[in-house]
């Protein structure tokens, strides 16, 4: 997470205690995993299975529609971000099973754990883009009618991905492998060494740009949208709105523990009891954040079932129904019937 963060497995009895029976052979490898690590492994396994299959299905469904349907572009990019992160899970899983020993080398240490941060930034920036899209559909329907197109959507996604990559660079640069002398183990973590201020800066930037600022802006955005929707029944696409609100809410819920522990650890001394306690929970917090990578397909399916009444359609067609529905503005006070019809034809063709 924020400092060299993976704890050793149950070697406590070799250290800081009275000398043991000197004729007992020393077990240099512990066999017991901590409870938080076991929970993390269970979550990782579930996330990997659901995330890979679910997101692959979402990619497959939306890829065909992405040329003409803007919602499909949004959901395709979210699914790609989640799918990429899920690919790192088998290695993270293996590392935890081996008591955080990292046999995969320095390059893998820099790249693979950084994928979850890339996912975090890509997801939140894409969610912000989607939210801006929802906002404009409700409050600037004429602008949307004229300018809202697939090309602009792809540009917005490219910008989101570019920024996400940029924001992931600090963690990528400071991620190193360290081989500990006793117990013998190679660890993969973030090492700021002399620069505690830089560590705090990275943690604060991550908290603000990846959590607090998006939370504030999206809360304001959706408050306005929901108020308009409820008061004037201004939009037909409540289905997509509900799905997006659910996706945004899950993002903040599942990233919260990671962000809180991350910021706390950056302000604590690595030898302090609180730091060590948080350190033990690190894998669990990362696994909890990883739930984001599989939750979206679940939301889509649940939403689809809700809209279908019960699961009568096949999974792909159900997902297609949820993910490729195009938003149409219907504001009777502002538009004539013909305007709405014309607009419907245009937006369905986008």
């Amino acid at each position: 997470m924020n400092s060299f963060n993976y704890t050793t497995p149950d070697y406590g009895h070799y250290d800081d205690k009275d000398t043991l029976d000197l004729n007992t052979p020393v077990d240099k490898t512990s066999n017991t995993l901590r409870v938080p690590d076991i929970l993390a492994l269970v979550i990782f396994a579930v996330v990997f299975l659901v995330g890979v299959l679910g997101n692959a299905l979402v990619v497959w469904v939306t890829a065909f529609e992405a040329k003409r349907t803007i919602n499909a572009i949004w959901f395709l990019n979210l699914a790609v971000a989640d799918f990429l992160s899920c690919l790192a899970l088998p290695i993270l899983f293996t590392s935890i099973v081996q008591h955080h020993h990292w046999p995969f080398g320095g390059a893998a240490c820099s790249i693979l754990p950084s994928l979850i941060l890339l996912n975090m930034y890509a997801s939140i920036l894409l969610l912000a883009t989607i939210s801006a899209d929802r906002f404009l559909l409700v409050f600037k329907p004429i602008w949307c009618q004229n300018f809202r197109g697939a090309g602009l959507a792809w540009i917005a996604c490219a910008v989101a991905w570019g920024l996400a990559l940029l924001l992931t660079i600090p963690s990528f640069l400071y991620r190193v492998v360290r081989e500990e002398y006793f117990p013998p183990k190679v660890l993969c973590g973030v090492d700021y060494s002399h620069d505690k201020r830089r560590e705090r800066a990275v943690a604060i930037v991550r908290l603000v740009l990846g959590f607090l600022w998006p939370l504030l802006t999206l809360t304001i955005c959706y408050t306005f949208i929901l108020l308009r929707t409820w008061s004037r029944r201004a939009t037909r696409s409540t289905k997509t709105l509900k799905v997006v609100v659910a996706v945004v809410a899950s993002f903040f819920i599942f990233w919260l523990p990671y962000q809180v522990t991350g910021i706390m650890m950056s302000f604590l001394e690595p030898s302090s009891p609180t730091f060590l306690l948080l350190n033990k929970l690190d894998s669990l917090c990362v696994s909890f954040a990883y739930i984001n990578c599989c939750i979206n397909p679940i939301i889509y399916v649940v939403a689809g079932q809700g809209f279908q009444g019960r699961l009568r359609k096949s999974l792909p067609s159900l997902l297609r129904n949820v993910l490729t529905e195009e938003s149409v503005v219907r504001e009777s006070k502002s538009f004539t019937r013909s305007t709405v019809d014309t607009m419907a034809q245009k937006t369905q063709a986008v």
């Epitope: 060299f4 993976y6 704890t7 050793t8 000197l22 004729n23 020393v26 002398y181 060494s193 030898s271």
Partner: antibody, heavy 121, light 112 residues
């Protein structure tokens, strides 16, 4: 008390090998790592590697690129360090030093008296 | 590798006066278990190194209480409250947190 007694001084030619022994007594040989550290004249200390006598598990300093081999004989509580392809810059005092795995100290605590190796043509 | 940098390299001290040696590491020496494996050794002329302080501030058995260690993370200090004649030698800091074990270049303490 803990004692680490090393073999005597050696004079070797460049390209040859040297094997130094370190006999341990006064503690459970199997419950420690035996480390080898060298000190060139007027220079600092340089860690070469370690062995866990219980299972022969070794770890070496990458600097020595396969030139160093550390072994141990549990039956005689003796550790050995062999350095091959000797060069003039390998002339140094070589120490064995124990790291007891099940103590409060968790440091290299006791050292042998040192073995002087001179590499000269 | 972790580079250990000691200062000063030479320390002339008057008997009975205090002495202080600094040691800085190129990486944090905090182990993932929370301990810091930074140790101090004294090598008297013609002898093997002997352990003085282990894990930053713990005196090894038989070491006089005039020796004390402090520090955290990457900056550490060895203090001798009143230097005695038997304290002459080369002082090394060493870390056993990471592989390879590394040592400072040594500080030679001599009596003025």
């Amino acid at each position: 008390q803990v004692q680490l007694v090393q073999s005597g001084a050696e004079v070797k030619k460049p390209g040859a090998s040297v094997k130094i022994s370190c006999k341990a007594s006064g503690y459970a040989f199997s419950n420690s790592w035996m480390n080898w550290v060298r000190q060139a004249p007027g220079k600092g200390l340089e860690w070469m590697g370690r062995i866990y006598p219980g299972d022969g598990d070794t770890k070496y300093n990458g600097k020595f690129k396969g030139r160093v081999t550390i072994t141990a004989d549990e039956s005689t509580s003796t550790a050995y360090m062999e350095l091959s392809s000797l060069r003039s810059e390998d002339s140094a005092v070589y120490f064995c030093a124990r790291f007891l795995l099940i103590s409060t100290v968790t440091a290299v605590d006791y050292w042998g008296q040192g073995t002087t190796v001179t590499v000269s043509s | 590798d972790v580079v250990m940098t000691q200062s000063p390299l030479s320390l002339p001290v008057t008997l009975g006066e205090p002495a202080s040696i600094s040691c800085r590491s190129s990486q944090s020496l905090v182990h993932s278990n929370g301990n810091t494996y930074l140790h101090w050794y004294l090598q008297k002329p013609g002898q093997s190194p002997q352990l003085l302080i282990y894990k930053v501030s713990n005196r090894f058995s038989g070491v006089p209480d005039r020796f004390s260690g402090s520090g955290s993370g990457t900056d550490f200090t060895l203090k001798i409250s009143r230097v005695e004649a038997e304290d002459v030698g080369v002082y090394f800091c060493s870390q056993s947190t990471l592989v390879p074990l590394t040592f400072g270049q040594g500080t030679k303490l001599e009596i003025k």
